[in-house]
Amino acid sequence: FERTRSLQDPCSNCPAGTFCDNNRNQICSPCPPNSFSSAGGQRTCDICRQCKGVFRTRKECSSTSNAECDCTPGFHCLGAGCSMCEQDCKQGQELTKKGCKDCCFGTFNDQKRGICRPWTNCSLDGKSVLVNGTKERDVVCGPSPADLSPGASSVTPPAPAREPGHSPQ
C-alpha cells in the first residue's frame, strides 16, 4: 500500500521535519527555521509556538514537533495544550473577575485553582460533623448522631445554595 501511495503521491515520501515543495517539483525540503512538521507528506510546515509572557517553555520546538509551554510560577495551565495561563489563588480562595476572593462561609477550596465548593452535608448520609469545615478544608463527617456517646452534640450547617461556577462579588 505504501508503494502504491507513493506512486500516486510523491509527497507521501516526505518525512516529518520536511515539506513537499510544489515550487521545486515536489522535492522534500527541510522546514524553515522556527517551524516544524510533525507528520510525513505535509505540503507546508507550521510556525513553532512561542512561550512568551506568562508562558514558559517546557519543551523546545524541533523540526518534527512543536514547542510545549507551561505557566510561570503563580499561574496554572488551562485549555488544550496549555492554551491559557490563569492566575493561582491561595487555598481558601477562588478567582473572580475582581481577582482572588475568600470562599464565603459554608464553602471551601483546597487547591490554588478552581472554585469554592460547598461543604459536605454530613446529615444527608445520616452522619454528623466530626471536624468543622474551613475555607481551605471540607468538613469531616463522622459516625451518625445515634452512634455518638451520650452528651455529645453535633451541628451540621446547611450548605448554602450556590450555583457552581459563580463567585461571590
Epitope: 525540503s29 524553515p32 522556527n34 505540503r43 507546508t44 507550521d46 510556525i47 513553532c48 512561542q50
Partner: antibody, heavy 119, light 108 residues
C-alpha cells in the same frame, strides 16, 4: 485560476464582534496556509496570523492574540477571521492571503474587506 | 520581532530613470525568506520578488532584487509609468512575519 474571495464591507459598533470570510477557489485548500493581514488607511501591512486548513493549526502575531480568532470550514474551502471587542483602532482593510511555510511569502491575496468601527 | 525599515517613505523618479529602494532588517534575515510586494492604490498587494531576487510571474525584467543579512534592495533599471505604486519588503524568521513600512514610488 487561484482566487480568494472575501466578504463585503462591514460597519459595526464599538465593543461588538465581526466575522470576515475568505473563500478559496482554484487550488487545494488544505495545501496552503491562509494568512490574514491588516492595513489601516494610508498605513503599512501588519500580519495577524494564519490557519493551516490541513490540521486546523493556527498561530497569531502576539499583537493580535485575543483580538482575532481564525477558523476554517474545509467543506466549503472557506477561512474566517473573527475580531472581538472592536474599537476604532480596528478600523482597517483586512486581507486574506495564501501562503505556505517553506516559501514564507504570500502569493495570492483576497480583494480586502473594509471594516469601519463607529458609533 | 524583526523590524523591517524602509527609510524612504516616498521617492520620485522620472521616466527612464534608474531607481533603488532599500530595506533594512533589525537583525539578520536569510535571503530565501526576504520578499517584496507591489501595491497600487485601492488594490491588494501582489508578490513582486520572492527570496531576495526571484521575479514573480509577469514582473518585467527591469525589476531586480539583491542583498543579504540585514540589507536588501529592489532596483528598477528604467522606470515606467505603470511602476507607480508602493513597494513593501517582508521577512520570515518565525513568528511574526513582518513588513517594512513601504516606499511609495511617484513618477514625475
Amino acid at each position: 485560476q487561484v482566487q480568494l474571495q472575501q466578504s463585503g464591507a462591514e460597519l459595526v459598533r464599538p465593543g461588538a464582534s465581526v466575522k470576515i470570510s475568505c473563500k478559496a477557489f482554484g487550488f487545494t485548500f488544505t495545501h496552503h496556509h491562509i494568512n490574514w493581514v491588516k492595513q489601516r488607511p494610508g498605513q503599512g501591512l501588519d500580519w495577524i496570523g494564519y490557519i493551516n486548513p490541513y490540521n486546523d493549526y493556527s498561530i497569531y502575531n502576539q499583537k493580535f492574540e485575543g483580538k482575532a480568532t481564525l477558523t476554517v470550514d474545509k467543506s466549503s474551502s472557506t477561512a474566517y477571521m473573527e475580531l472581538s471587542r472592536l474599537t476604532s483602532d480596528d478600523s482597517a482593510v483586512y486581507f486574506c492571503a495564501r501562503g505556505g511555510l517553506g516559501r514564507g511569502y504570500f502569493d495570492y491575496w483576497g480583494q480586502g474587506t473594509t471594516l469601519t468601527v463607529s458609533s | 520581532d524583526i523590524v523591517m525599515t524602509q527609510s524612504t517613505a516616498i521617492m520620485s523618479a522620472s521616466l527612464g530613470e534608474k531607481v533603488t529602494m532599500t530595506c533594512r532588517a533589525s537583525s539578520s534575515v536569510t535571503s530565501s525568506y526576504l520578499h517584496w510586494y507591489q501595491q497600487k492604490s485601492g488594490a491588494s498587494p501582489k508578490i513582486w520578488i520572492s527570496s531576495t531576487s526571484n521575479l514573480a510571474s509577469g514582473v518585467p525584467v527591469r525589476f531586480s532584487g539583491s542583498g543579504s543579512g540585514t540589507s536588501y534592495s529592489l532596483t528598477i533599471s528604467s522606470v515606467e509609468a505603470e511602476d507607480a505604486a508602493t513597494y513593501y519588503c517582508q521577512q520570515y524568521s518565525g513568528n511574526p512575519y513582518t513588513f517594512g513600512g513601504g516606499t511609495k514610488l511617484e513618477i514625475k
